[in-house]
Amino acid sequence: QPPPPPPDATCHQVRSFFQRLQPGLKWVPETPVPGSDLQVCLPKGPTCCSRKMEEKYQLTARLNMEQLLQSASMELKFLIIQNAAVFQEAFEIVVRHAKNYTNAMFKNNYPSLTPQAFEFVGEFFTDVSLYILGSDINVDDMVNELFDSLFPVIYTQLMNPGLPDSALDINECLRGARRDLKVFGNFPKLIMTQVSKSLQVTRIFLQALNLGIEVINTTDHLKFSKDCGRMLTRMWYCSYCQGLMMVKPCGGYCNVVMQGCMAGVVEIDKYWREYILSLEELVNGMYRIYDMENVLLGLFSTIHDSIQYVQKNAGKLTTTIGKLCAHSQQRQYR
Amino acid sequence: SAYYPEDLFIDKKVLKVAHVEHEETLSSRRRELIQKLKSFISFYSALPGYICSHSPVAENDTLCWNGQELVERYSQKAARNGMKNQFNLHELKMKGPEPVVSQIIDKLKHINQLLRTMSVPKGRVLDKNLDEEGFESGDCGDDEDECIGGSGDGMMKVKNQLRFLAELAYDLDVDDVPGNNQQATPKDNEISTFHN
């Protein structure tokens, strides 16, 4: 094995290199010293390093490591951040369009139900947006509230236009009757199923993307342990203490050091793989009633059908409700 | 049949979020994301190698540094940690991940669990005509999963039809709707992706 070349007798080369790391030369010895105070770059003979230099090298090594991690994750991070933003905005746009379609349907088919219908539709879609973003709202309650609110207006404006519209008493009775009599048939249940399934999937999809960002950010900003810092310093910088400025670390040695430094990070691997494959499975299933775009943009049509269903059964319903809510109506007419 | 508010459906200005081709659908965009994400499947296992390949490492030189001395690149000493006695690599590995890494692993486990439970079982909603019509109340049987709702031409044939809309400088309003009674069936322009 070749003997190591003698260190630069004046530490001149080491000084000029170190000056790039740390302007101000007071830490570099003029000539090689014993280096008995060194803790990382333990010398076999005279050395051009001091304890302070060693500390600076450790800091630089850890910074290098952080920068390398950040450059490794740059494209991946951009991919997830960009897509999370794109999908969040796209989902909001879908909700906005679904609301506009539904309002347009009311305006063009049931002008007498506006503006109250607009108000209820607006509240429903606001809840949809909040749910997607993680709010603790129950989808069935949202749908029930929409139909509970709509029925009194449909009853007083379409089915029984002679009734004065200011009475809260009959509204309460009508809201109750809506569920008891299954006024809208199976449509509310159908909408609940479709909306809850599609929104759940959408919500978890966005949650997963946001967690992806968190995972990358965590590894991006990892603080490496002191032991790791020392190993990196020995690998990248200790050769300089011997004046070996141009020598590079051995490949196998680098791999061993990195495995040690990154043992914890590499443990993420198994769960990261599972994350990508599980997300793929979810995405493969996001169609038809599991696709919020499909479901929400078709809601106006299903709501229209549900109103038609009410109109079709109007005669029967008016009689039944007349008896059921008679007390409320009498109080109203007085 | 329900009035289909056709001009609300994009009105020539294309909803294009983050510079996505206007023919693109949410569905194709999702598949594109997954295909790209899958290329990062080895991200964590490949990190140590990445760091070494992006930092100075002896490739063509005959001599290299093993942490303690200059050695020949292919000698046994080249891969060995030059100062074994100073601190133990094995110990470093045994310490286990940082608390912040353990925390993120727990979060990944949780989301993976959620993703698996939310995934649609294979064949669950397959082989059904997307454009099924003639729905009457009670037509769905016990499981409304199979229902898409809608009657006759009132049924909007929606399959990922929201095209990506450009920055949306305006907000579509109900008052923009003229009273025409057209039914729109947008094309389902999806790019070709996986064919297993």
Epitope: S73, F78 | E21, K38, S39, I41, F43
Partner: antibody
């Protein structure tokens, strides 16, 4: 060291099909996409499609959908591309390339396989 | 498909000089552009990905920049081994597309 070793040049008559191989080493085969790219004489590069050894999924450029079939043998870490109904238009150099890890870009390429279709 | 318009198609430069190649995409490609060096009889070699990230072992004489639809690639302090054809590749879209190539020659 990452390597993609492609099969040697082939000369075939128009009509039948030809199968070219891309043997890989130096990385975990199942973790990376294998893409195929065509370069006709004096022309630029054209993407044909990709295969993902992890799950066998493929994705084709529509232009080559009926021309190329991408397959794998994971036991030998080898990717294959079969070109069918050969015509002189298919005469070109075909490259396999690896993508993934830290970018979706094609980061390592094979040396290319020259296919000449001539009667 | 996304078209990549690469220019110039050929250029000659002196050793030690600087050259710049540009690629214009038909739509925003979100920084998903890579640059390759291609020599006869070999496979292309990736120099830069994601607009400006240098591959390991590639000298810092090579650089890339740009955003949106417009991207450029430069080689400074030209050396004899840089003589080759250079291609850009967009990988924003799943259907990857290359530029037509730039043949670099010595003056």
């Amino acid at each position: 060291e990452v390597q993609l070793q492609q099969s040697g040049p082939v000369m075939v008559k128009p009509g039948p099909s030809v199968k070219i191989s891309c043997q890989t080493s130096g990385f975990t085969f199942t973790d990376y996409y294998i893409h195929w790219v065509k370069q006709s004489h004096g022309k630029s590069l054209e993407w044909i499609g990709l295969v993902f050894p992890y799950d066998g999924g493929t994705n084709y450029n529509q232009k080559f959908k009926d021309k190329a079939t991408l397959t794998l043998d994971t036991s030998s870490s080898t990717a294959y591309m079969e070109l069918n109904s050969l015509t002189s238009e298919d005469s070109a150099v075909y490259y396999c390339a690896r993508a993934g890890g830290f970018s979706y870009a094609l980061n390592y390429w094979g040396q290319g396989t020259s296919v000449t279709v001539s009667s | 498909d996304i078209q990549m318009t690469q220019s110039p198609s050929s250029l000659s430069a002196s050793l030690g000089g600087k050259v710049t190649i540009t690629c214009k995409a038909s739509q925003d490609i979100n920084n998903y552009i890579a640059w390759y060096q291609h020599k006869p009889g070999k496979g292309p070699r990736l120099l830069i990905h994601f607009t400006s990230t240098l591959q390991p072992g590639i000298p810092s004489r090579f650089s890339g920049s740009g955003s949106g639809r417009d991207y450029s690639f430069s080689i400074s302090n030209l050396e004899p081994e840089d003589i080759a054809t250079y291609y850009c590749l967009q990988y924003d879209n799943l259907l990857l597309t290359f530029g037509a190539g730039t043949k670099l020659e010595l003056k």
